[in-house]
């Protein structure tokens, strides 16, 4: 089956959610781990990640179509310390499949705002930190 990983972001007030979505077939979930790394160009692994999610096969899902699993990492207030390059990755302990998402970046600016760049699906986000609005 075709397995792929996408990265996205959303904002709720001051919170920034970084989302790693893995698309896979139901039977491929077992043994899969999804993880998010920061500033790790070569050694992104579950052990060095900020957060990881181990997928489980859900017997409650019928059919053999493609399903998605999401890892969400929430930053309550983005600070200059969050600036850097992030990457969503996944790997299967059963099949040895390894997925690497596109790199995306958080840049905290001198004005106290921040931008998230490099996301696919037209997701270039620019956030005003104080107002918590999408500009």
């Amino acid at each position: 089956g075709c397995i792929n990983i996408t990265s996205s972001a959303s904002q709720e007030g001051t919170r920034l959610n970084l989302i790693c979505t893995v698309w896979h077939k139901k039977e491929e979930a077992e043994g899969f781990v999804v993880f998010l790394c920061k500033d790790r160009s070569g050694d992104c692994s579950p052990e060095t990640s900020l957060k990881q999610l181990r997928l489980k096969r859900d017997p409650g899902i019928d059919g053999v179509g493609e399903i998605s699993s999401q890892l969400m990492f929430t930053i309550s207030q983005v600070t200059p310390l969050h600036s850097g390059t992030y990457q969503c990755c996944a790997r299967s302990q059963k099949s040895g499949i390894r997925l690497q998402g596109h790199f995306f970046s958080i840049l905290f600016t001198e004005t106290g705002n921040y931008t998230v760049t490099g996301l696919k699906q037209r997701q270039h986000l620019e956030f005003s930190h104080n107002e918590g609005t999408l500009s």
């Epitope: 900020l50 929430t74 207030q77 600070t79 200059p80 310390l81 600036s83 850097g84």
Partner: antibody, heavy 119, light 107 residues
């Protein structure tokens, strides 16, 4: 178990230098931004400096800018605070602390290193 | 720079009493964090993001507030709660600021 152990504190004359170290264990040190927070005797807490996970960016409170330098060695799981041109008002217990990644709270603290600046 | 003003500076409370400590910010802030510190010990995270209890904190503690006014409440004071409590916030560009502390003593 997360452990932060400070060392290097002591008695120093005004204008002199001192370097504090903080040895970290029990977590992936290179993932976390780190900080120094100080507490003058019988006084409150005061943030001093922070450094990002890779060590490339650092931030300071105004009163220590140009005198203090925060740094880290991820291979040694250690962060440092180089304190130059020390003043009597720098007398305090200096705590090493970790930044919680998802929040703006300092979640783990060392036991503190006492720095006394006096002639 | 945002200034955090805690009140009262010192207070005493009897076991079982309800205790409220307040922290006022000179400008609006998004979240407030609280720490507990006992003599000779390091500060411990106590309440984060205004109302979430840190690991191991008894549920007699609660936090609330928004904008410039925040509070920490103990519903039934116990002897082990005697300590100094500090509020803390993050704001750009002043970064991290703490209140001066509230010393809570057992009556």
């Amino acid at each position: 178990e997360v452990q932060l152990v400070e060392s290097g504190g002591g008695f120093v004359q005004p204008g002199r230098s001192l370097k504090l170290s903080c040895a970290a264990s029990g977590f992936t040190f290179s993932n976390y931004a780190m900080a120094w927070v100080r507490q003058a005797p019988t006084k409150g807490l005061e943030w001093v400096a922070s450094i990002n996970s890779g060590g490339g960016d650092s931030y300071y409170r105004d009163s220590v800018k140009g005198r203090f330098t925060i740094s880290r060695d991820n291979a040694k799981n250690t962060q440092y605070l180089q304190m130059d041109s020390l003043r009597s008002e720098d007398t305090a217990t200096y705590y090493c602390a970790t930044h919680n990644y998802g929040s703006t709270i300092f979640d783990y603290w060392g036991q503190g290193a006492m720095v006394t600046v006096s002639s | 720079e945002i200034i955090l003003t805690q009140s009262p500076t010192t207070m005493t409370a009897s076991p079982g009493e309800k205790v409220t400590i307040t922290c006022r910010a000179s400008s609006s802030v998004s979240y407030m964090h609280w720490y507990q510190q006992k003599p000779g010990a390091s500060p411990k995270p106590w309440i984060y993001e205004t109302s979430k209890l840190a690991s191991g904190v008894p549920d007699r503690f609660s936090g609330s507030g928004s904008g410039t006014s925040y509070s920490l409440t103990i519903n039934n004071m116990e002897a082990e709660d005697a300590a100094t409590y500090y509020c803390q916030q993050w704001n750009y560009p002043s970064m991290y600021t703490f209140g001066a502390g509230t010393k809570l003593e057992l009556k």
